[in-house]
């Protein structure tokens, strides 16, 4: 059964500075990643940004740069200033869509240490 | 415009063979999956078959496995479905349709749909 | 494979009224809810995506709710072109499934 992964860390370099990284553990092949935060996508959270393979990235403030790592993992790095910034308890979620398998997603928040946290 | 065409249908009877065709045009069509879709008389909607744009990644429905063959030809921007071993179960208006990943792989355009009637 | 429950499977209404189809899944399906509209003769016609977001040109008195396992397809006031069969979708989980259907006719 494919699986996500999703790790939240905070950068020492700018204390509200938030990096996301989430992995698809499966077979498909990707057609989409939509990263959100406050809950999954469909549950009241917030979308964040979303990657297509083929047709590019789109993300919202305070999302400043979201990026493939692989064919199927991804980051995102987030603002650490303005209103709309992320506090310590917040959760993101990642949602990996394969066609035509489906989707899948999980979410994580930063753990209560500065180590990175790994949560699936 | 976004335009899907299906052809090929008809009367054959029970063990017989059909070849469905759906004429794609007004867009990428190697980018999209693509998906057949089949209605039998005055019943619900039932996903029979689909293809992922890389054109390995498929589905069928169990009871057309072994039977039915989706394939797609990019260079004449057209669906095709094969269908063997046809049984009166089988008879059904059969439309083609699109995915759109943004969408969250619903169905955003569909063909006329082309009947096929399987009776001894 | 998910099942898509859809209700009422028929409903009579007058122009003007205000309708409510539910759609209820068997297990949670995200955001993954689509909503079709279809006329005898004709293929289905998608209306509303991602739950709540209409499709290009869809009127506004045309809405989706709902999350998790419950979802509901409203028309604000019915127009006498709204009088069709309305199909349930989830397509989280492959094999993507339909609801039933809901015949809305005239009173």
């Known amino acids: 059964t494919p699986e996500v992964w999703v790790q939240v860390r905070m950068e020492a370099t700018e204390l509200s500075s938030f990096t996301i990284r989430c992995g698809f553990l499966g077979s498909g092949s990707i057609s989409l990643v939509t990263v959100s935060w406050g809950g999954p996508n469909g549950a009241g959270g917030t979308t964040l940004a979303v990657l297509h393979p083929e047709r590019g990235i789109r993300q919202w403030a305070p999302a400043r740069q979201a990026r493939w790592e692989t064919q199927s993992s991804i980051s995102l790095i987030l603002e650490g200033s303005g209103a709309s910034s992320p506090c310590a308890n917040t959760t993101f979620c990642c949602k990996f869509a394969s066609f035509p398998e489906g989707s899948w997603e999980a979410c994580g928040s930063l753990p209560p240490s500065s180590d990175p946290g790994l949560s699936a | 415009e976004v335009q899907l065409v299906e052809s090929g249908g008809g009367l054959v009877k029970p063990g017989g063979s059909l070849r469905l065709s759906c004429a794609a045009s007004?867009?990428?069509?190697?980018?999209?999956?693509m998906s057949w879709v089949r209605q039998a008389p005055g019943k619900g909607l039932e996903l029979v078959s689909a293809i992922n744009s890389n054109d390995i990644n498929t589905y069928y429905l169990d009871t057309v496995k072994g039977r039915f063959t989706i394939s797609r030809d990019i260079a004449k921007n057209s669906l095709y479905l094969q269908m063997n071993s046809l049984r009166a179960e089988d008879t059904a208006v059969y439309y083609c349709?699109?995915?759109?990943?943004?969408?969250?792989?619903?169905?955003?355009?569909w063909g006329q749909g082309t009947l096929v009637t399987v009776s001894s | 494979d998910i099942q898509m429950t859809q209700s009422p499977s028929s409903l009579s209404a007058s122009v003007g009224d205000r309708v409510t189809i539910t759609c209820k899944a068997s297990q949670s399906v995200s955001n993954d809810v689509a909503w079709y509209q279809q006329k005898p003769g004709k293929a289905p016609k998608l209306l509303i995506y991602?739950?709540?977001n209409r499709f290009t040109g869809v009127p506004s008195r045309f809405s989706g709710s709902g999350s998790g396992t419950d979802f509901t397809l409203t028309i604000s006031s019915l127009q006498p072109e709204d009088f069709a069969t309305y199909f349930c979708?989830?397509?989280?989980?492959?094999?993507?499934?339909f609801g039933q259907g809901t015949k809305l006719e005239i009173k």
């Open positions: 979708q989830q397509a989280y989980r492959s094999p993507w499934t």
């Open positions: 007004g867009f990428t069509f190697s980018s999209y999956h």
């Open positions: 349709a699109r995915h759109e990943d943004y969408y969250g792989f619903a169905m955003d355009y």
């Open positions: 991602y739950v709540s």
